[in-house]
Structures are given as C-alpha cells and as structure tokens.
Amino acid sequence: YPYDVPDYAGGGGSGGGGSMMTGTIETTGNISAEKGGSIILQCHLSSTTAQVTQVNWEQQDQLLAICNADAGWHISPSFKDRVAPGPGLGLTLQSLTVNDTGEYFCIYHTYPDGTYTGRIFLEVLESSVAEHGARFQIP
C-alpha cells in the first residue's frame, strides 16, 4: 500500500487504556520455528466493545506493519520481502533467520479504551527441533 512515511521507529510496551478498559489480548505466546521457514503471529482482542482503529506490529523498536481500519495494510519497506499481511489482523513472517529471534508486539489502537499491547516471543532454531501448534505453522 503506497504510504509516505519519513521513518518507521515505533514504541512498544504494555498498553495503558481508558478508565473502562476491560479488554484483554490473547496471543500465540512463546513460539519457535525453523530457520528458513515461516510463522504466523496472531493476537486477538476480546472482552471489549472498543472500536479498533489500527493495529501496529512491532519488533522491539521497529515498526513491521500496520493494519488500518480505513487504509488497510502497510508493510514497512525494510520488511516487505519477508513479511506478509494476515491472516486477519495477524502477520506472517517468511524466510526466517536466527536474527528474527526476539520479542514481537501487537499494538491495538482502540476507541475509547486506548492502546492494548500483546507480546509474542519467537525463537528461530537452526535445526528441525522447533515444535509449536500446527495452527500457527506454515508448512
């Protein structure tokens, strides 16, 4: 999606939220995958009627992708060859390297609650010892 963006650094951390912040974010938790393979990062916001206006996917302090309610998906140029949108509000990481090991955050921007943040830890393994739920693995 053709966006004009001067820089891509973003914030992480856990969300604050509004005075009636009731929602919770469910994530895939700690997951592992094989080098060269693919993985789906998934978050789900529940227990709130807040309107989701945007979801940001971040790796530590780097913005990977945005899913905006109006404008749809935008993938940061530095990741466009290895990151694919979806399924849903999730994010697919492809051609994994050991350097992809680390924390990933889904940040839900909502109204009126504010921001909700989910954390996923991905470990990329050299060999075929990676084990995780099939629903998050892409063969």
Partner: antibody, heavy 119, light 107 residues
Framework: EVQLVESGGGLVQPGGSLRLSCAAS????????MHWVRQAPGKGLEWVAF????????YYADTVKGRFTISRDNAKNSLYLQMNSLRAEDTAVYYC????????????WGQGTMVTVSS | DIQMTQSPSSLSASVGDRVTITCRAS??????LAWYQQKPGKAPKLLIY???TLQSGVPSRFSGSGSGTDFTLTISSLQPEDFATYYC?????????FGGGTKVEIK
C-alpha cells in the same frame, strides 16, 4: 515537502458559525489521519478533533462535541472544521495537524488560523 | 480524561546548559507520550514520540525517557534556537491531552 495551510478564520459573533479549511500538499493525504488542535491567546494547546484517513473514525473533545464537525475531502486534499454555536471561549488559533502513520503523535502542523468570537 | 502536569512551568538557562523538563500523567499511559517545541507565533514541532523515539530531523541533543506516569525531556546542551515553550502530550487514548507547557528562557 509536507505542507498544511489553514484558512477560514476571522471575527464572528457569539452563536455564529465558521468553517475552517486545511489544504494539504506534499504527501498522500488520503493515507493519513488528521487532527484539529487549538490554542487560546497566551494559553496552552488543546486537542479538538480527529478524523481517520477514510473518515470511518471521528472523535471530538467534550468541549466542542455537538457544535463542531470535522470532515475531509480526499479528492481535494482538504480537511475541514465546521464550527457552530460559537462561544467566546472558542477564541483561539486553530491548527490542523497530520497524524503519524503509526498513530504515535502529530508530525506536521499548519501555521494556524485565528478565530475570534466576540460581540 | 488523563491530566498531564508539566514542571517547571518556566525556567531560565544559559547556552550549553543541560535542561530537564518533567511531565506526569494522572494515570498510566505506557510509553505513549510526545514532546513538542513551540516558538512564539509558530506552530508546534514534534520532537519525540512514544516516550523516547526521536522524530526524524530532530537534533540528538533532545532525548526523552520514562514510562507509565513519569516522563522526562532532556536537552543535553542548550542551543540558542532551543529557547521556546515545550509541551508534553499523551497519545495513549482519546481525548489526547497536553501538559500546560514549560517556557525555557535565556538567563
């Protein structure tokens, strides 16, 4: 170069109406959420309203809710603020500002347009 | 609404000084705080967002820190062009709210 230019300010009597415009250039306007922020003479900044890139999300400060209407025309690269039932306390410089793509703050601001509400 | 309290409201400093401005939120806003600089008769300029991320083109003498409710803007070595008013603003939830401002004046 990103540019935001406000217009439409002026002197209006209490209870009157004004329509502010903000002309955007130098970026793909239809991709960005936009804000109006105001500043009363000698005072601090006050957020007024927000509209998302496709107008599906619109939020207002309680102080203007029901009186002000934010809108945009992406084909014209323009943002608007229709102000009705104006009060003396609405006197301020009104700025339009662009929301960062990542939704983290306002990265470009116009020069502002002065609105004076007085009899 | 989240209340943002800045301190001090004004300060006098000299070129080369290290200047620190604090901002406190009435409830946790995680890292979602921005800092703006405004000069008389001009529009605000974004310096820092998400607590500590420097906006593109802003000199590295500006830095931000903090999370939760307490945040700090630091100017490591004050330059002549830095004399201005600084505002903090939470961008965690609507309505977005600003601090009252800190005016940095020449000593």
């Amino acid at each position: 170069e990103v540019q935001l230019v406000e217009s439409g300010g002026g002197l209006v009597q209490p209870g009157g109406s004004l329509r502010l415009s903000c002309a955007a250039s130098g970026f793909t306007f239809s991709n960005f959420g936009m804000h109006w922020v105001r500043q009363a003479p000698g005072k601090g900044l006050e957020w007024v309203a927000f509209i998302s890139s496709g107008s599906s999300s619109i939020y207002y400060a309680d102080t203007v809710k029901g009186r002000f209407t934010i809108s945009r025309d992406n084909a014209k690269n323009s943002l608007y603020l229709q102000m009705n039932s104006l009060r003396a306390e609405d006197t301020a410089v009104y700025y339009c500002a662009r929301m960062r793509l990542d939704y983290y703050a306002m990265d470009y601001w116009g020069q502002g347009t002065m609105v004076t509400v007085s009899s | 609404d989240i209340q943002m309290t800045q301190s001090p409201s004004s300060l006098s400093a000299s070129v080369g000084d290290r200047v620190t401005i604090t901002c406190r939120a009435s409830k946790s806003i995680s890292k979602y705080l921005a800092w703006y600089q405004q000069k008389p008769g001009k529009a605000p300029k974004l310096l820092i967002y998400s607590g500590s991320t420097l906006q593109s083109g802003v000199p590295s003498r500006f830095s931000g820190s903090g999370s939760g409710t307490d945040f700090t803007l630091t100017i490591s070595s004050l330059q002549p062009e830095d004399f201005a008013t600084y505002y903090c603003q939470q961008h965690n939830e609507y309505p977005w709210t600003f601090g009252g401002g800190t005016k940095v004046e020449i000593k």
